[in-house]
């Protein structure tokens, strides 16, 4: 495939990445799949600067990111190391709360109304953000 040099239509470029901001809601797994079908991934926040950029675009709305602990450890969907990476949890989070009564705890991370992170039930239909890197080879065949 060829190297992507500019963002697709309706995507926002920032720091050599492209971002797409949903206006509807999906469960985390469906949002994850949506991004993958776009040759992208749920947003992976690697810095305070990127946090502020995303926060500015989503506003005070619960929004999924590409962080989950459905297999035990917290993992970013692109393989970025959680342990050494940027974190912006709300105080007292993550708490893997069981009191919602929906079964299981809380395994998926989202931006809250103030931008800080919370873990929540992955089935909740929140908005989401897809991200893809401009320097990444695209799956589309090169134009001849």
């Amino acid at each position: 495939g060829s190297e992507r040099t500019c963002c697709p239509v309706n995507w926002v470029e920032h720091e050599r990445s492209c971002y797409w901001f949903s206006r509807s809601g999906k469960a985390w797994a469906d949002a994850d799949n949506y991004c993958r079908l776009e040759d992208a991934h749920l947003v992976v926040v690697t810095s305070w600067e990127e946090q502020k950029f995303v926060q500015h675009h989503i506003g005070p709305v619960n929004t999924w990111m590409g962080l989950h602990d459905q297999n035990g450890p917290w993992k970013w969907v692109d393989g970025t190391d959680y342990e050494t990476g940027f974190k912006n949890w709300r105080p007292e989070q993550p708490d893997d709360w069981y009191g919602h009564g929906l079964g299981g705890g809380e395994d998926c991370a989202h931006f809250t109304d103030d931008g800080r992170w919370n873990d929540d039930v992955c089935q909740r239909p929140y908005r989401w953000v897809c991200e893809t890197e401009l320097d990444k080879a695209s799956q589309e065949p090169p134009l001849l």
């Epitope: 708490d95 069981y98 079964g103």
Partner: antibody, heavy 115, light 107 residues
Framework: EVQLVESGGGLVKPGGSLRLSCAAS????????MNWVRQAPGKGLEWVSS????????YYADSVKGRFTISRDNAKKSVYLQMNSLRAEDTAVYYC????????WGQGTLVTVSS | DIQMTQSPSSLSASVGDRVTITCRAS??????LAWFQQKPGKAPKSLIY???GLQSGVPSKFSGSGSGTDFTLTISSLQPEDFATYYC?????????FGPGTKVDFK
């Protein structure tokens, strides 16, 4: 590498107390709930207690409620189990384990309650 | 409380055999089920998380399936190091509960 190391087990008389500790390393401790699980000699596994990452939520098995207290110190990356009013049936190997699906376990510490 | 049952309670098998252990929950637990292997004198080891997710470092001969109330752990080709006791555990709701275990020994 994730590591959990329990300590504090030993022989105690019925009605006595013991405090177990579990020291964690290799992960962001405050991001994970922690659990105590026990296994009586020759028996199966029994969940004892859980505490959420920042200690906001605590849960106990009915068999230990009112006698055992779970706590954690995130600065020290440790979780504790204070066991009071111990009974013979509390005799077991006590394990600490990470998260609700118990993905990592310590080696265990033996608690023997006997006169 | 959710009760977990396992069958069989024990089984005898030979190296190379395909082994299947079943676990049943007394009420639906979605996929909030884990499987563990325990050898005598050792701590349990996590094999499967989320009913079918293989834990990091666990060989692919282990697989898990099921959802709701009925679950299965399969060892595709039993090796000498696999003779042990296997437990299932639900983490759908507190109190977390374990199955009674299935002991796999030499035929």
């Amino acid at each position: 590498e994730v590591q959990l190391v329990e300590s504090g087990g030993g022989l105690v008389k019925p009605g006595g107390s013991l405090r177990l500790s579990c020291a964690a390393s290799g992960f962001t401790f405050s991001s994970y709930s922690m659990n105590w699980v026990r296994q009586a000699p020759g028996k199966g596994l029994e969940w004892v207690s859980s505490i959420s990452g920042t200690g906001s939520f605590i849960y106990y098995a009915d068999s230990v409620k009112g006698r055992f207290t779970i706590s954690r110190d995130n600065a020290k990356k440790s979780v504790y189990l204070q066991m009071n009013s111990l009974r013979a049936e509390d005799t077991a190997v006590y394990y600490c384990a990470r998260v609700s699906g118990f993905d990592y376990w310590g080696q265990g510490t033996l608690v023997t309650v006997s006169s | 409380d959710i009760q977990m049952t396992q069958s069989p309670s024990s089984l005898s098998a030979s190296v190379g055999d395909r082994v299947t252990i079943t676990c049943r929950a007394s009420q639906a637990i979605s996929n909030y089920l884990a499987w563990f292997q325990q050898k005598p004198g050792k701590a349990p080891k996590s094999l499967i998380y989320g009913a079918s997710g293989l834990q990091s470092g666990v060989p692919s001969k282990f697989s898990g399936s099921g959802s709701g109330t009925d679950f299965t752990l399969t060892i595709s080709s039993l090796q000498p190091e696999d003779f042990a006791t296997y437990y299932c555990q639900q983490y759908n709701s507190y109190p977390f509960t374990f199955g009674p275990g299935t002991k796999v020994d030499f035929k």
